[in-house]
């Protein structure tokens, strides 16, 4: 299931003397497309241009992150007169052109979405040959990837003075709320660290001092689901070691 916000248009005038107001470079992309991790999403992009009946070589490009300079994730090229845009680059083989660039459509399908795909994407078309021109969406389309929580790490670590602390890291979008439960704890939200920079979908919760032996469970929950994982603490009493 994919949700697309209402289209906005990037209408940009081309200053070529021979181009009338009706024939100008513009790109139509929605501001945002939402889809769940594991699913596929379609990034729509259509364009208009001032070069009537252009049938020369063309290249269609999608890049991520920022316009003009972000890394390419997809590129295909169509020879003069050809409707087939041959893929030259598809990052991890997950990007596929749905549209026909000859018909002013650069729409892209992204398969097997992951949270790391949550970023802004920019479509671009380049004409080569007799006419040589290019244009890229400057605002792009934000791909918003949602995901049920997944606990990626749970561990018990030594603390000063022979104490122990527990850490739980989960990912999800929206970022999940984390709670710890365990001996003499009840349900505790614990010290939740904000998502780390560059790891926007990761949340960590810490139990600073484990006072009792037994099973400690971390629960991660967001609007799409919940996940839990447990860790066991057993200290050898009379010794300074512990088994987890």
């Amino acid at each position: 299931f994919v949700r697309t916000k209402i289209d906005t248009t990037e209408n940009l005038l081309n200053t070529e003397v021979h181009s009338s107001p009706a024939q100008r470079w513009s790109m139509q992309v929605p501001p945002e497309v939402s889809a769940e991790a594991g699913d596929a999403a379609v990034l729509p992009c259509t364009f208009t241009h001032p070069h009537r009946h252009y049938d020369g070589p063309l290249t269609a490009i999608w890049r991520a992150g920022e316009p003009y300079a972000g890394p390419q994730v997809f590129r295909c090229a169509a020879a003069r007169g050809s409707e087939l845009c041959q893929t030259a680059l598809s990052l991890h083989g997950r990007f596929r052109l749905l549209g026909n660039p000859r018909r002013n459509d650069l729409s892209l399908r992204v398969e097997r979405l992951a949270l790391a795909d949550d970023r802004r994407y920019f479509c671009r078309v380049e004409f080569a040959g007799d006419v040589h021109d290019r244009y890229e969406s400057r605002h792009g389309v934000r791909l918003h990837v949602t995901a049920a929580p997944r606990i990626v790490n749970i561990s018990v670590l030594p603390s000063p003075a022979h104490a122990f602390r527990a850490l739980c890291t989960a990912e999800g979008e929206p970022p999940p709320a984390l709670a710890w439960s365990g001996p003499a704890l009840g349900n505790s939200l614990a010290a939740v660290r904000s998502p780390r920079e560059g790891h926007g979908h990761l949340v960590t919760a810490e139990l600073p001092a484990l006072t009792h032996d037994g099973r400690y469970t971390c629960t991660a929950a967001n609007s799409l689901g919940r996940s839990e994982a447990s860790v066991y603490l057993f200290r050898f009493h009379g010794a300074s070691g512990a088994s987890t």
């Epitope: 940009l12 081309n14 003009y68 390419q72 590129r75 030259a88 080569a128 021109d133 890229e136 400057r138």
Partner: antibody, heavy 118, light 112 residues
């Protein structure tokens, strides 16, 4: 760090051929157009040729069309310029450059001198 | 071909003073709003050219903010405030709008 390193040029007689190459590193080679720009002794910069991402499209300045061939090997991250029927006016330092379109000729090699003389 | 005309051909500047270089194109380099294909390069003596400014006014990576580009359509200016000894060299404007891609003839900056 982006690096572009041209091969050695040299002295060549008029009418003869020479091939220049440029080894690139520090960026995703196939994501960019590449170009050759030359500079005659004590003169300004003159664009020579450009090649598209997958070598599907090449552009040349009129004075070298039919004599020079620009090519690239994305697997080896190398750019080449085959120069045939060389003339004395082709004498120049040749630079390979990464052509970023909206970002200009963003990175340049150190340059290699080609002298065409009998 | 688009002709890029630079003025002056050379200028001599006192350290700490400002310098201004003009570049005029024979055709508008405005492709669409916010997208103008004009660039400035500096070639220091015995070195390769280096990108200074892209798309009229954007500073390239590592370029000090003493350099400022401005202009539109056919008239462009590179201004260097507080000129330093290391700024000597030849400054070129260039266009990437149309093939053949062209450069100005260069402006030589010297320190008094």
């Amino acid at each position: 760090e982006v690096q572009l390193v041209e091969s050695d040029g040299g002295l060549v007689q008029p009418g003869r051929s020479l091939k220049l190459s440029c080894a690139a590193s520090g960026f995703t080679f196939s994501d960019y157009y590449l170009a050759w720009v030359r500079q005659a002794p004590t003169k300004g910069l003159e664009w020579v040729a450009s090649v598209s991402y997958d070598a599907i499209t090449n552009y040349y300045r009129d004075s070298v069309k039919g004599r020079f061939t620009i090519s690239r090997d994305n697997a080896k991250s190398t750019l080449s310029l085959q120069m045939d029927s060389l003339r004395s006016e082709d004498t120049a330092t040749y630079y390979c450059a990464r052509q970023d379109w909206e970002g200009g000729f963003a990175y340049w090699g150190q340059g290699t001198l080609v002298t065409v003389s009998s | 071909d688009i002709v890029m005309t630079q003025t002056p051909l050379s200028l001599s500047v006192t350290p700490g003073a400002s310098a201004s270089i003009s570049c005029r194109s024979s055709k508008s380099l405005l492709h669409s709003p916010g997208l103008t294909y004009v660039f400035w390069y500096l070639q220091k003596p015995g070195r390769s050219p280096r990108l200074l400014i892209y798309r009229v006014s954007n500073l390239a990576s590592g370029v000090p903010d003493r350099f400022r580009g401005s202009g539109s359509e056919t008239d462009f200016t590179l201004k260097i405030s507080r000129v330093e000894a290391e700024d000597v060299g030849i400054y070129y404007c260039g266009q990437l709008l149309e093939n053949p891609f062209t450069f100005g003839s260069g402006t030589k900056l010297e320190i008094k």
